[in-house]
């Protein structure tokens, strides 16, 4: 059988000879060299060599336990002549013994950590960890103790755990933000002769809201012209807060003052400034100075710091309204006037008035914007604003005239205002009714008396208030002995009726009927229109076959029946 125990070997051997490990030996070995010892497994033939005759094992290289703590090899004892094993192949272990040749190494070369300012003593900051590659199961080579080399009295470290804690009360970020702490890890339980490593911990105090906003001055003064429209920024105020980020955010509000309704304050989120803006239209002539009380406050407050006082501050803002030379102001935004279309030239239609709103009350002159009255139909009295006609009007040509009147300060022509004038032309009965179309019709030779051969329609350019009422009649000169009659339908239409039985186109091929159309407005207007009637041969249905003259092209749908 094999005769050996577990082999032990000290790491980091520095001798000049190979390091002796031990001897493999079989009790079958007679010592005559008839056996051959063979080594296989971890490092065999390289790290570990065997004298094949004696079984002596040696290590050829310096071994590092931290690289490999255990080597597992196999041994054979074989009869050199036959190759026959005299023992079963067997596994054995070479265990590498530790020496303290590794210093503790921190998991990071540099740690970064944060802790809120004003934290209580003993507040956890960060845990640092150092590992020692030496054997933790043997001696104290890997027993690490932590200590602080730099960073007192602000911070401390727990020797066993590497937990860094705050050690000083009321550490104020606004006073100092960054701390560099150096921690040492030492093996051998911190004893003399132990190996050590260090790491740097960069600790940043994070902000808490322990500072209120403060205005750098108690009073601000701004000027703004009275013409500033609502929303116009007129000045910026800024309170400063020693905190940062959310803790330095400021909200501005107007809390008091006679300008409370006239001005607003908005917070610029980027610059943390309060912007005073115009809320309502200003009027220098009414009020020249306003005072406001503006408050700056932190929206987020930490209750534990309320004992330091209110987290707000206020300042007085004085706003001076500056006078602006304003243009004249018309009494109305627009004027609507009316005039009859038969008005004579120089007829007054109405008037406009404008006043300078400034304290100076500068006199005003009026004029018509000629771009809006190219035909110069209207004029204005430059002194009193009276509008009058300068040409005759015609409602039927243009119902509405839209013109612009300008009011200009006499002392400062640059200051002017404009107002629209809408002038409606009222209707006068100055147009006669007339036929709606040209009428040319026919009558059959065999027509019976009182047959309707044409319906007449009329139109009138006027627009009477109560609507059109037309009357139709034959002209007096044609009324007696006429072959046709006009029947007024009392609905603004009339019919032409035959007056006898039968017509002879050879005797009279064409009749011209003068018809008088009248309206019933004042003054009455009338006109005479002529209707041409041709006599034609018709079939027994009353359809035209031929006329003495050229064939008629009859309007579609016109009834010619008996």
């Amino acid at each position: 059988s094999w005769m050996w125990n577990q082999f032990f070997l000290l790491e980091e051997y520095t001798g000049s000879d190979y390091q002796y490990v031990g001897k493999l030996h079989s009790d079958q070995d007679r010592g005559d060299g008839s056996l051959k010892y063979i080594l296989s497994g971890d490092g065999a033939g390289d790290l570990f060599i065997i004298n094949e005759n004696t079984g002596d094992i040696q290590a050829t290289k310096r071994l590092d336990r931290e690289e490999k703590p255990v080597y597992i090899l196999r041994a054979q004892a074989i009869n050199r002549r036959t190759g026959r094993p005299v023992e079963p192949e067997s596994e054995f272990i070479i265990k590498i013994h530790d020496i303290n040749d590794n210093e503790p190494i921190f998991t990071k070369e540099v740690y970064t950590a944060t802790v809120p300012e004003m934290s209580d003593v003993g507040t956890f900051v960060v845990q640092v960890t150092a590992t020692d590659a030496d054997d933790p199961t043997y001696g104290n080579s890997a027993k690490v103790v932590y200590s602080i080399l730099q960073g007192q009295p602000y911070f401390s470290v727990e020797s066993e755990t590497g937990i860094i804690k705050t050690a000083l009360l009321n550490m104020d970020r606004e006073n100092r933000e960054q701390y560099q702490v150096v921690i040492q890890a030492k093996d051998m339980g911190g004893q003399m002769g132990g190996l050590s490593g260090t790491t740097t911990v960069n600790i940043t105090l994070t902000d808490v809201n322990d500072n209120p906003p403060r205005f750098p001055q108690s009073t601000y003064q701004f000027k703004t012209p009275e013409s500033s429209p609502p929303g116009t920024p007129i000045g910026r105020i800024k309170a400063s807060d020693a905190d940062v980020g959310e803790n330095a955010e400021i909200e501005y509000s107007i809390t008091d003052g006679e300008g409370l309704d006239m001005f607003d304050v908005i917070t610029d989120q980027e610059t943390q400034e309060g912007i005073i803006t115009v809320k309502k239209l200003l009027d220098f002539e009414k009020k020249k100075v306003y005072t406001l009380k503006v408050e700056a406050s932190n929206p987020y407050v930490e209750p534990r710091f309320l004992y330091l006082g209110p987290f707000k501050d206020s300042a007085t803002v004085r706003i001076v309204v500056e006078d602006v030379d304003e243009p004249p102001v018309f009494s109305k935004l627009a004027y609507i006037l009316q005039i009859r279309e038969d008005a004579q030239i120089n007829t007054t239609i109405g008037s406009v008035t404008a006043q300078d709103p400034d304290a100076a009350r500068n006199p005003v002159k009026y004029s018509v914007d000629r771009h809006t009255d190219m035909d110069r139909i209207f004029n204005i009295d430059s002194g009193n604003g009276s509008i009058f006609t300068s040409k005759l009007l015609d409602r039927e040509t243009l119902l509405w005239h839209n013109i612009t009147v300008i009011a200009t300060e006499i002392n400062n022509p640059k200051q002017s205002s404009r107002v629209p004038l809408y002038i409606k032309v009222l209707d006068v009965n100055d147009n006669a009714p007339e036929f709606a179309e040209f009428y040319e019709t026919f009558v059959c030779e065999k027509a019976k008396a009182d047959q309707l051969i044409q319906t007449l329609h009329a139109v009138d350019k006027d627009d009477p208030y109560s609507g059109h009422q037309f009357s139709f009649s034959l002209a007096p000169e044609a009324a007696s002995g006429s072959n046709f009659t006009i029947q007024d339908n009392k609905d603004n239409t009339a019919g032409i009726l035959t007056r006898k039985n039968g017509y002879n186109r050879h005797e009279m091929s064409t009749y011209l009927l003068p018809v008088v159309i009248s309206d019933n407005d004042y003054p009455v207007q009338s006109s005479t229109g002529t209707v041409t009637v041709r006599v034609c041969a018709c079939d027994h249905h009353g359809n035209m076959q031929s006329c003495h003259a050229e064939a008629l092209i009859h309007p579609t749908g016109l009834s010619t029946g008996a």
Partner: antibody, heavy 117, light 111 residues
């Protein structure tokens, strides 16, 4: 390079003896056993015996035990095989071979011995 | 003596085909997991050449188309893809017990 060089062919009379040499080179002669194997014409291989050059310990097959003698000269790294009382059936090619853990890893070129009256 | 019986006596195989030679020992030649069985190749007019030792270990310089397997009494030499230069007589040999003995040989030829 390991080499085993054998002596030349021999023609012998029945009843006489023959001594074949085998000179080794390219390795430590005393570290390996030297074996002798013969091959009769058209036949297979037949192990005759071996010797440990460091101690001159020998082993012979029963068939040749009385007639074969294997020796070495360590100074010249040469092994010898002497076969006596030759008969016609001893006509064969005789090989020396280096033994390592029961296997023959290097062989001589062979020596032809002819036994004829 | 341990008798080594090889089969077949001769074998004709096509180029590129597998050739398998068997060797049976009259008793076990294995001990402690070591199989004391070795294989040789002998070409015409030349001394034998070691191919496989301890049943399955390929001797240095021998092509890997040769392989050995087996234990106790039954062993096999396999040529996975026969080449023209593999034409030879193949012998098995045991070193388990004196006298060391060889198989009768198997002649391998090209079909």
């Amino acid at each position: 390079e390991v080499q085993l060089v054998q002596s030349g062919a021999e023609v012998k009379k029945p009843g006489s003896s023959v001594k074949v040499s085998c000179k080794a080179s390219g390795y430590t002669f005393t570290n390996y056993w030297m074996h002798w194997v013969r091959q009769r014409p058209g036949q297979g291989l037949e192990w005759m015996g071996d010797i440990d050059p460091s101690h001159s310990e020998t082993h012979y097959t029963q068939k040749f035990k009385d007639r074969v003698t294997i020796t070495v000269d360590k100074s010249t790294s040469t092994a010898y095989m002497e076969l006596s009382s030759l008969r016609s059936e001893d006509t064969a090619v005789y090989y020396c071979a280096r033994g390592d853990l029961g296997r023959f890893d290097y062989w001589g070129q062979g020596t032809t011995v002819t036994v004829s009256s | 003596d341990i008798v080594m019986t090889q089969s077949p006596d001769s074998l004709a195989v096509s180029l590129g085909e597998r050739a398998t030679i068997n060797c049976r020992a009259s008793e076990s030649v294995s001990i402690h997991g070591t199989h004391l069985m070795h294989w040789y190749q002998q070409k015409s007019g030349q001394p034998p050449k070691l191919l496989i030792y301890a049943a399955s270990n390929l001797e240095s310089g021998v092509p890997d188309r040769f392989s050995g397997s087996g234990s106790e009494t039954d062993f096999t030499l396999t040529i996975s893809s026969l080449q023209a230069e593999d034409v030879a007589v193949y012998y098995c040999q045991q070193s388990f017990e004196d006298p060391w003995t060889f198989g009768g040989g198997t002649k391998v030829e090209i079909k």
